[in-house]
């Protein structure tokens, strides 16, 4: 039965004389008069079994003490730590030249754990042990005793076990403690790889290469390897493991992210708190779920807050300039927590009588700088029809708008374009021609661009070539031009006027008055 004593983690004790309860019962030769097992009290008044010999009076001492069989446990090199006290020969009463101040340490490898006798010639000498000057002061009972500590190593060993022997040649010595141990590199976790208990190599310079295995919930980044040095220290860690997604390193383990935390990738990062407006309800989350009404865009990193579509733009102002409209607005009060806000313009052309009957403006309308994806809060819309009702909607959008389309995201304004000069009249006809007059009629312009206030008819004799012309104005779409010369070619132009001004004149209509007092009715532009 052995009591527990604490030693370094990299040492595995095979024998500790101080931990043995009761007698050690090692074999001495000679049986009497040589090594003697003696119990002394330690500082806790606990008996320590020691071996002592002090045959300093007589010459030619050869006293052997052999331990019990010590199992090797797979170790190729073992260490022997001896704590002893050795009397200075000068301090001994009546002693002359027979006294020695050294003893010898031996070992013998054997597969037999029951050898009863000491055969000196079987033993191999490890070293001669002398007391050095570096004493350890140890309390033995109420007395301080100077203890020497010497450590020797032996190897490579190959048999199942071995015996140690101590040869006294005439010293006054007490073996207070004998400990035999081997060194191992203790089980350790380095870079999230576990390396098993590894017995050191056979010689004092050997390095044992050991491959590590990733701890639970981790994966190899590079193959983890370490070297077990002869002194039981792990050396030169190579490679590492990384905690899987949803796990982080804590105390050398990969532990699941706590509730409210997440980790998206296998990295050496720690779990992060769920971004704003998101949550995790389980341990080990690899991402966090967005709160109700919040979303994450496809290209948003898991680390980004969940966001929502923006509210409607504010303070939409319109400025109509004839058939153009300039719109300006303010950013939404709530951008949804995103930076990627942009604006889309929707243009609808609405009937004057029923504003609800609107339809898309079509491709003829132009937008500066653009209709969709506007980054600025203004747009200029051109090529509208004059004197027309338009409704413009400004939509605020961001990267998550598509997940929750909501009318609240737009603001609208309805405008009527200004009256503009009308377009030219497409068709002018001579309805009746006489010697002295021409009756003209025409159609309303294609694009009146407002209320037609009047029409202006310009005419002149063809050979005068507009050097001298006359103007007739009428509110109707027809008029009689009188006071003309017979048999004369006249050129007629008609244009319409709105409050915004005159439109372009129509294409010329050439008409020749008659020579006889009869009517000629024509409907072409060039009646003769």
């Amino acid at each position: 039965v052995t009591g527990s004593r604490v030693y370094p983690a990299n040492e595995v004790t095979l024998l500790d004389s101080r931990s043995v309860q009761g007698e050690l019962g090692w074999i001495a030769s000679p049986l009497e008069g040589g090594w003697e097992e003696v119990s002394i009290m330690d500082e806790k008044n606990t008996p320590i079994r020691t071996y002592q010999v002090c045959n300093v009076m007589e010459p030619s001492q050869n006293n052997w003490l052999r331990t019990d069989w010590i199992t090797r446990e797979g170790a190729q090199r073992v260490y022997i730590e001896i704590k002893f006290t050795l009397r200075d020969c000068n301090s001994l009463p009546g002693v002359m030249g027979t006294c020695k101040e050294t003893f010898n340490l031996y070992y013998y490898e054997s597969d037999n754990d029951k050898e009863r006798f000491i055969r000196e010639n079987q033993f191999v000498k490890i070293d001669t042990i002398a007391a050095d000057e570096s004493f350890t002061q140890v309390d033995i009972g109420d007395r301080i005793m100077k203890l020497n500590t010497e450590i020797r190593d032996v190897g490579p060993l190959s048999k199942k076990g071995f015996y140690l022997a101590f040869q006294d040649v005439g010293a006054c010595i007490a073996l207070v403690s004998v400990r035999v141990f081997y060194k191992k590199c203790p089980l350790t976790v380095r870079n999230l790889a576990q390396f098993p208990d590894t017995i050191t190599g056979a010689d004092t310079s050997s390095l044992v290469e050991v491959r590590g295995s990733c701890v639970n919930n981790s994966e190899e980044k590079d193959v983890p390897k370490m070297y077990c040095g002869a002194d039981g220290e792990w050396l030169v860690p190579i490679g590492n493991c990384l905690c899987n997604a949803g796990h982080e390193e804590r105390s050398g383990e990969c532990q699941a992210c706590k509730i409210g935390y997440y980790k998206a990738l296998s990295t050496d990062a720690t779990c992060a708190k769920c971004p704003p407006h998101s949550y995790s309800v389980w341990e080990g989350a690899t991402s966090c779920t967005c709160d109700r009404g919040f979303f994450r865009a496809d290209n948003d990193a898991a680390s980004m807050p969940c966001t929502r579509p923006p509210s409607a733009p504010l303070n939409l102002i319109s400025n109509v300039n004839e058939t153009s409209v300039n719109l300006e607005w303010s950013s939404p009060q709530n951008t949804g927590g995103r930076q990627d806000i942009s604006y889309n313009v929707v243009c609808k052309k609405c009937g004057a009588g029923d504003p609800s009957k609107c339809r898309p403006c079509g491709s003829g309308v132009h937008y500066t700088p653009q209709q969709n994806g506007l980054k600025t809060t203004k747009v200029s819309i051109t090529d509208l029809l004059a004197h027309t009702n338009y409704t413009f909607e400004i939509w605020a959008v961001n990267g998550v708008s598509k997940y929750n389309p909501n009318p609240d995201q737009s603001v609208s304004v309805t405008v009527t374009t200004n009256q503009a000069a009308p377009s030219s009249i497409a068709l002018v006809q001579a309805k009746e021609v006489t010697r002295y007059s021409v009756a003209l009629a025409w159609l309303e312009p294609d694009r009146p661009n407002g209320v037609i206030l009047e029409y202006e008819v310009k005419y002149y004799e063809k050979d005068q070539n507009e050097r001298s012309y006359r103007i007739v104005r009428t509110a109707a779409r027809n008029t009689d031009i009188k006071g003309l010369n017979p048999l004369t070619s006249y050129v007629f132009h008609v244009r319409a006027r709105t409050a915004a001004g005159y439109g372009d004149f129509s294409e010329p209509l050439e008409v020749t008055t008659n020579t006889v007092p009869s009517r000629i009715i024509g409907d072409g532009a060039n009646s003769t």
């Epitope: 009972g141 109420d142 007490a174």
Partner: antibody, heavy 121, light 106 residues
Framework: QVQLLQSGAEVKKPGASVKVPCKAS????????MSWVRQAPGQGLEWMGW????????TYAQGFTGRFVFSLDTSVSTAYLQISSLKAEDTAVYYC??????????????WGQGTLVTVSS | EIVLTQSPATLSVSPGERATLSCRAS??????LAWYQQKPGQAPRLLIY???TRATGIPDRFSASGSGTDFTLTISRVEPEDFAVYYC????????FGQGTKVEIK
Amino acid sequence: QVQLLQSGAEVKKPGASVKVPCKASGYTFTSYAMSWVRQAPGQGLEWMGWINTNTGNPTYAQGFTGRFVFSLDTSVSTAYLQISSLKAEDTAVYYCARVRTTPYGDGMDVWGQGTLVTVSS
Amino acid sequence: EIVLTQSPATLSVSPGERATLSCRASQSVSSNLAWYQQKPGQAPRLLIYGASTRATGIPDRFSASGSGTDFTLTISRVEPEDFAVYYCQQYGSSWTFGQGTKVEIK
């Protein structure tokens, strides 16, 4: 058993000599030094010195040189204390004692019963 | 020569009581000190060596401590057979005895 046997009391006249034997038994005589201790009547103990039983080499304490001689006869495992030119102040019990030397310290672990030497005219 | 001074010269105790004897050296003797017991008409008996190691057969009510110049012998519970004279003896440099302490019945 281990024991030291001394001779009986001696009465001597001043100027005479006395040889006190100390016979060892029960152990190897030459393995332990032998010490001599004096105790005058009603007084304390006084260490006189020792002799290496292996080599016969003696060591004398201060005040015990000249008239005092330690000797051996290893063949009969006996140590001797000889005092010459006895004086009245030499009257005392003389003890032989085995010197036990250990790694932890020394001590006189086995004692003879003592020999009373009386010097009187 | 190293002088050992024992105190008190006489210690009166009742059986069962604790007795503490002191021995002081004129210079350090390290742990090289022994204690002896002597009863009237008998040879001394080795009790302690090495300042604190009990000799073979000595009851554990006897204990000793000290190092350097100050040493103590303690009898935890004095028995009737313990009434005697006690001597300390140093073997650090030559050998000398203290003058003794007499433990008598109170």
